[in-house]
Interface confidence: medium
């Protein structure tokens, strides 16, 4: 079976506070079996912003259905930007156990906010 | 304006070595991953290399996997190939590239510096 | 590995007349596709981007399409310094990053 690949395109993405930010990220393989979550930031500190098996995370949503079998595309919309938003977005594969543990991650993007045009 | 001159290639025996360097100059150097891209004679591009602007990000493609090692010094704002074990299929012009800052296309090339490997 | 194919190989034409290149990708790539212009001794020029959209003083005879895994470099009206080689990149699926084999552009 291939290798699983986390493919998150952009390396940086900028939006206008108040608007919605989408975070780009496709993975190659369905296995291992287990959820994508996404984290802003790295190491101890990273927040999390989605996971497919929690919720509800009110101002994400997924670009695709996440809840199809076949589906491999773990894309996200954030709406309402703010600067607190700024940061460095991980598209992170688990594998399936009691708990879930990180199996990959993808590059990253980094999210930029404008000011709000006047 | 952007500038990228490539220098370090000519002429060797497979199984020797050489190092390319690619000097930038008209942009934030450390701010900007960038690649080493190649062209064998009547050949299309084959990328070969990337460094992230920190240096920490490293890949290579398959063919040069073990043998090139790609760094670079953000004091001096030069990029470098050190490549080893050479062969007759890296025959080619060595280009350096800069990435744009948001995706992986190439906003700016140099115009290359010719290795031959030959016995 | 995502690899792509442009056709045709070679592009004979005359000034004046409109060329059409065309790469496919092995999957999809979105519209994460670049197309590179490159004559001898020179650098490699960055064209397209996006697909679609031109680069930074590039002129509007050249116009790029397609998505997925589909995509089309036009030029609509060749001008003698447009003849050259054009390759197109795909930076989606990375690294590798790729290039197609090149289509060249020559004059009838």
């Known amino acids: 079976e291939e290798e699983l690949q986390i493919i998150q395109p952009d390396k940086s993405v900028s939006v206008a506070a108040g608007e919605s930010a989408i975070l780009h990220c496709t993975i190659t393989s369905l296995f291992p079996v287990g959820p994508i979550q996404w984290f802003r930031g790295a190491g101890p500190a990273r927040v999390l912003i989605y996971n497919q098996r929690q919720g509800p995370f009110p101002r994400v949503t997924t670009v695709s259905e996440t809840t199809k079998r076949e589906n491999m595309d773990f894309s996200i919309s954030i709406s309402n930007i703010t600067p607190a938003d700024a940061g460095t977005y991980y598209c992170i594969k688990f594998r399936k156990g009691s708990p879930d543990t990180e199996f990959k991650s993808g590059a990253g993007t980094e999210l930029s906010v404008r000011a709000k045009p006047s | 304006d952007v500038q990228l001159v490539e220098s370090g290639g000519g002429v060797v025996r497979p199984g020797e070595s050489l190092r390319l360097s690619c000097a930038a100059s008209?942009?934030?150097?450390?701010?900007?991953?960038m690649n080493w891209v190649r062209q064998a004679p009547g050949e299309g591009l084959e990328w070969v290399s990337l460094i992230s602007g920190s240096g920490e990000i490293i890949y290579y493609a398959d063919s040069v996997k073990g043998r090139f090692t790609i760094s670079r010094d953000n004091s001096k704002n030069t990029l470098y190939l050190q490549m080893n074990s050479l062969r007759a299929e890296d025959t080619a012009v060595y280009y350096c590239?800069?990435?744009?800052?948001?995706?992986?296309?190439?906003?700016?090339w140099g115009l290359g510096t010719l290795v031959t490997v030959s016995s | 590995e995502t690899v792509l194919t442009q056709s045709p190989g070679t592009l004979t034409l005359s000034p004046g007349e409109r060329a059409t290149l065309t790469c496919r990708a092995s999957?999809?790539?979105?519209?994460?596709l670049a197309w590179y212009q490159e004559k001898p001794g020179q650098a490699p020029r960055l064209l397209i981007y996006g697909a679609s959209s031109r680069a930074t003083g590039i002129p509007d005879r050249f116009s790029g399409s397609g998505s997925g895994t589909e995509f089309t470099l036009t030029i609509s009206s060749l001008q003698s310094e447009d003849f050259a080689v054009y390759y197109c990149q795909q930076y989606y699926d990375r690294p590798p990053l790729t290039f197609g084999g090149g289509t060249k552009v020559e004059i009838k």
């Open positions: 999957q999809s790539v979105y519209t994460y």
């Open positions: 008209g942009f934030t150097f450390s701010s900007y991953d």
């Open positions: 590239a800069k990435e744009n800052n948001r995706y992986r296309f190439f906003d700016d």
